[in-house]
């Protein structure tokens, strides 16, 4: 495997992470934090190791910034439950809060 | 304690619609969510989807998309579930159960004691 | 979806024997299993659920093992009120699925 396919897959999988994170925002549904930390780890990292590496970086930088600004640690290992969850190749639909709209 | 207390039984022609209710008690009505589920003697138990009752948006099981439609009034704690264009095969007892949380997925320890749907010309 | 059969479909026992249910997934579930015991006329009663947890006032003769794609339902001493249908449930990712039903009859 290439540097260069590893590169491809990190931005593939770094874009998955952002997604997930505005489809979050837009969403703004009660108790969907979790599926959609799993859902963007999951995608990006069936990209490949580039995919995986990159939610990782996302994530620990995000996990980084929040604790900076206060993000409560109950939360924050929850968020990482569910960011390993999607990482390892579990369905993220565990996590998929009722009535979530499909587009989700 | 928790209860769920469903509607009496239906008897109802093929082609129509009906309405069947289900009412929780005991515990905080829009923490939980709602799911119902099928039993009839060809398959079972099947899931036939759920609804948030913090939202009232349901969530259903491919299966019975456009059979189902989930509603719910917070106002008196209850989850509907109309079933429409009745044939033979929704004949069955339709069970409301708890879920132990607000996710699709879930386990049910918390049982309505059944609607009995009889479609009959 | 997720396919959850049971074995066997139907078994006969006696009173105080040890019977075994067992319910394999078509894929893995993990340890995302319920089980449920279901008495004629009755609504399904909860046993255990992350395969092995047992459910509130559930007797300790009651015991769910197993994880990935196979899973099992001990039951120890059998009482009379054990006797009805059992089915176990899959509660990881959707469509939730039940499996085929174990009918056990006093011998």
């Known amino acids: 495997r290439s540097f260069f396919s590893f590169l491809g897959e990190a931005f593939d999988g770094a874009r998955d992470m952002w997604r997930a994170y505005s489809d979050m925002r837009e969403a703004n549904y009660i108790g969907s934090d979790k599926y959609f930390h799993a859902r963007g780890n999951y995608d990006a990292a069936k990209r490949g190791p580039g995919g995986a590496w990159a939610a990782e970086v996302i994530t620990d930088a995000r996990e980084n910034i929040q604790r900076f600004f206060g993000h409560g640690a109950e939360d924050s290992l929850a968020d990482q439950a569910a960011n390993e969850w999607g990482r390892s190749g579990k369905d993220p639909n565990h996590f998929r809060p009722a009535g979530l709209p499909e587009k989700y | 304690q928790v209860q769920l207390q469903q509607s009496g039984a239906e008897l109802v022609r093929p082609g129509v619609s009906v309405k069947i209710s289900c009412k929780g008690s005991?515990?905080?009505?829009?923490?939980?969510?709602m799911h119902w589920v099928k039993q009839s003697h060809a398959k079972s138990l099947e899931w036939i989807g759920v609804?948030?009752?913090?939202?009232?948006?349901?969530s259903y099981n491919q299966k019975f998309k456009g059979k189902a439609t989930m509603t719910e009034d917070k106002s008196s704690s209850t989850v509907y579930m109309e079933l429409a264009r009745l044939t033979s095969e929704d004949s069955a007892i339709y069970y409301c159960?708890?879920?132990?949380?607000?996710?699709?997925?879930?386990?049910?320890?918390?049982w309505g004691q059944g609607t009995l749907v009889t479609v009959s010309a | 979806d997720i396919q959850m059969t049971q074995s066997p479909a139907s078994l006969s026992a006696s009173v105080g024997e040890t019977v075994t249910i067992t319910c394999r997934a078509s894929?893995?579930?993990?340890?995302?299993l319920a089980w449920y015991q279901q008495k004629q006329g009755k609504s399904p009663q909860l046993l255990v659920y992350?395969?092995?947890t047992l459910a509130e006032g559930v007797p300790s003769r009651f015991s769910g093992s197993g994880s990935g794609t196979q899973f099992s339902l001990k039951i120890n001493s059998l009482q009379p009120e054990d006797f009805g249908s059992y089915y176990c449930q899959h509660h990881y990712g959707t469509p939730i699925t039940f499996g085929t039903g174990t009918k056990l009859e006093l011998k």
């Open positions: 992350n395969a092995k």
């Open positions: 609804i948030n009752t913090y939202y009232g948006d349901a």
């Open positions: 005991g515990y905080t009505f829009t923490d939980y969510a």
């Open positions: 894929e893995n579930i993990y340890s995302y």
């Open positions: 159960a708890r879920g132990s949380s607000i996710m699709i997925t879930s386990w049910f320890a918390y």
